[in-house]
């Protein structure tokens, strides 16, 4: 009875993300056989995320709706190993939107999930953030620098990284 | 004031090439973006060319990509506009624009009176 | 490209009375309650002159008279009341995403 209303609850639960997500890789937490966590396939996980990147070129606004359609944010990079992580999917020649922006032009930085922007947890190039006008952030490839962060206008169409929390069943 | 002055247009055979130039005075031009946008004979505006103010990125839409280079001299409030392989649909009244950016966009705040290129055999 | 299309085409107002210009677009231009459209006046062998950006900011110079509401996908530019100076063609552009695009005008004449 147990073990079948856990699988009612996991069918109801799985059916809310069908669709947008019709099918999720999913792998047991720990050692207990209850407890399962999920990403859309092919989404990869890290820790509690998991993530997308976006071969599509879009706008900042465009990217970040995008993501948002499929239950997710534009990426918040909160240490230096999710970056470490992420960057093993990114391409060198390209650059991705990255959750953080400038709206107002002032240096206000903002993540698009509210977490608040930590000076220290920064991940720029030298030199950048360079430009008021660039109110929007990539992650790109730096020979010199390997990857990093600059700012760059919004409007411009590039690729992106969409970032969500795990599905738990 | 904000002046802007487009010179450089004239009459030009499909395939030849032309450089426009837009002088700017009355405001700091190497803290702005600057844009040409064309209007031809009857027609909506058409974005031709965008360079940021820094002078660190330029953008075509498809139409003129490849044929079009914008690029600036801050030094001497100078923008230009180098057209190369011209067609007859590049005919129109060329107009040097600034950029004032809000927000995730930006929007044209002062425009210069225009130049006129015709391309025809 | 983000497709906006203006309506009318033309429109004859006495002075006085109101004007009333609609532009849609072919997807959103807002976001987050930012609404990037803007709105141009351009009189005869004259450069377009820009009258509101931001969907309902009014420049600064520009006669209150002239006032732009809208979101997402549907704006509005209204001259109220009209005046015989405001004889010219108006245009509505979009700049949240490259290419910048414009309306394809609306013409407006005065009685």
């Known amino acids: 009875n147990f073990m079948y209303s856990k699988t009612v609850k996991r069918l109801s639960k799985l059916r809310e993300y069908q669709q947008y997500h019709p099918s999720l890789t999913c792998v047991m937490e720990g050692k207990d056989i209850e407890d399962w966590s999920c990403c859309p396939t092919p989404w990869t996980s890290f820790q509690s995320s998991c993530y997308f990147i976006s071969t599509g070129m879009q706008s900042w606004t465009k990217s970040q709706k995008n993501c948002s359609v499929m239950g997710a944010d534009l990426v918040v990079i909160n240490t230096r190993e999710e970056q470490d992580f992420i960057i093993q999917n990114l391409k060198r020649n390209s650059s991705y939107f990255l959750g953080l922006s400038d709206p107002g032009g002032r240096r206000h930085w903002q993540w698009v999930d509210q977490t608040p922007y930590n000076e220290n947890v920064t991940f720029w190039h030298s030199g950048e953030p360079n430009n008021l006008d660039e109110r929007c952030a990539i992650i790109n490839f730096r020979s010199s620098e390997e990857w990093g962060w600059n700012d760059i206008h919004c409007h411009v169409p590039q690729k992106s990284i969409c970032k969500m929390k795990k599905i738990y069943i | 004031e904000v002046q802007l002055v487009e010179s450089g247009g004239g009459l030009v055979k499909p395939g030849g090439s032309l450089r426009l130039s837009c002088a700017a005075s009355?405001?700091?031009?190497?803290?702005?973006?600057m844009s040409w946008v064309r209007q031809a004979p009857g027609k909506r505006l058409e974005w031709v060319a965008t360079?940021?103010?820094?002078?660190?990125?330029?953008y075509y839409p498809d139409s003129v990509k490849g044929r079009f280079t914008i690029s600036r001299d801050n030094a001497k409030n100078s923008l230009y506009l180098q057209m190369n392989s011209l067609r007859a649909e590049d005919t129109a009244v060329y107009y040097c624009?600034?950029?004032?950016?809000?927000?995730?966009?930006?929007?044209?705040?002062?425009w210069g009176q225009g130049t006129t290129v015709t391309v025809s055999s | 490209d983000i497709v906006l299309t203006q309506s009318p085409a033309s429109l004859a107002v006495s002075p006085g009375q109101r004007a009333t210009i609609t532009c849609r677009a072919s997807?959103?231009?807002?976001?987050?309650?930012?609404?990037?459209m803007h709105w141009y006046q351009q009189k005869p062998g004259q450069p377009p002159k820009l009258l509101i950006y931001?969907?309902?900011n009014l420049e600064s110079g520009v006669p209150a008279r002239f006032s732009g509401s809208g979101s997402e996908t549907d704006f509005t530019l209204t001259i109220n009341p009209v005046e015989a100076e405001d004889t010219a063609n108006y245009y509505c552009?979009?700049?949240?995403?490259?290419?910048?695009?414009f309306g394809g005008g609306t013409k407006v004449e005065i009685k």
């Open positions: 360079i940021s103010s820094g002078d660190s990125y330029t």
């Open positions: 009355g405001f700091t031009f190497s803290s702005y973006g």
């Open positions: 931001a969907a309902s």
């Open positions: 624009a600034r950029q004032l950016y809000y927000s995730y966009g930006y929007y044209f705040d002062y």
């Open positions: 552009q979009q700049s949240i995403e490259d290419p910048p695009t």
């Open positions: 997807e959103s231009v807002s976001f987050h309650g930012t609404h990037l």
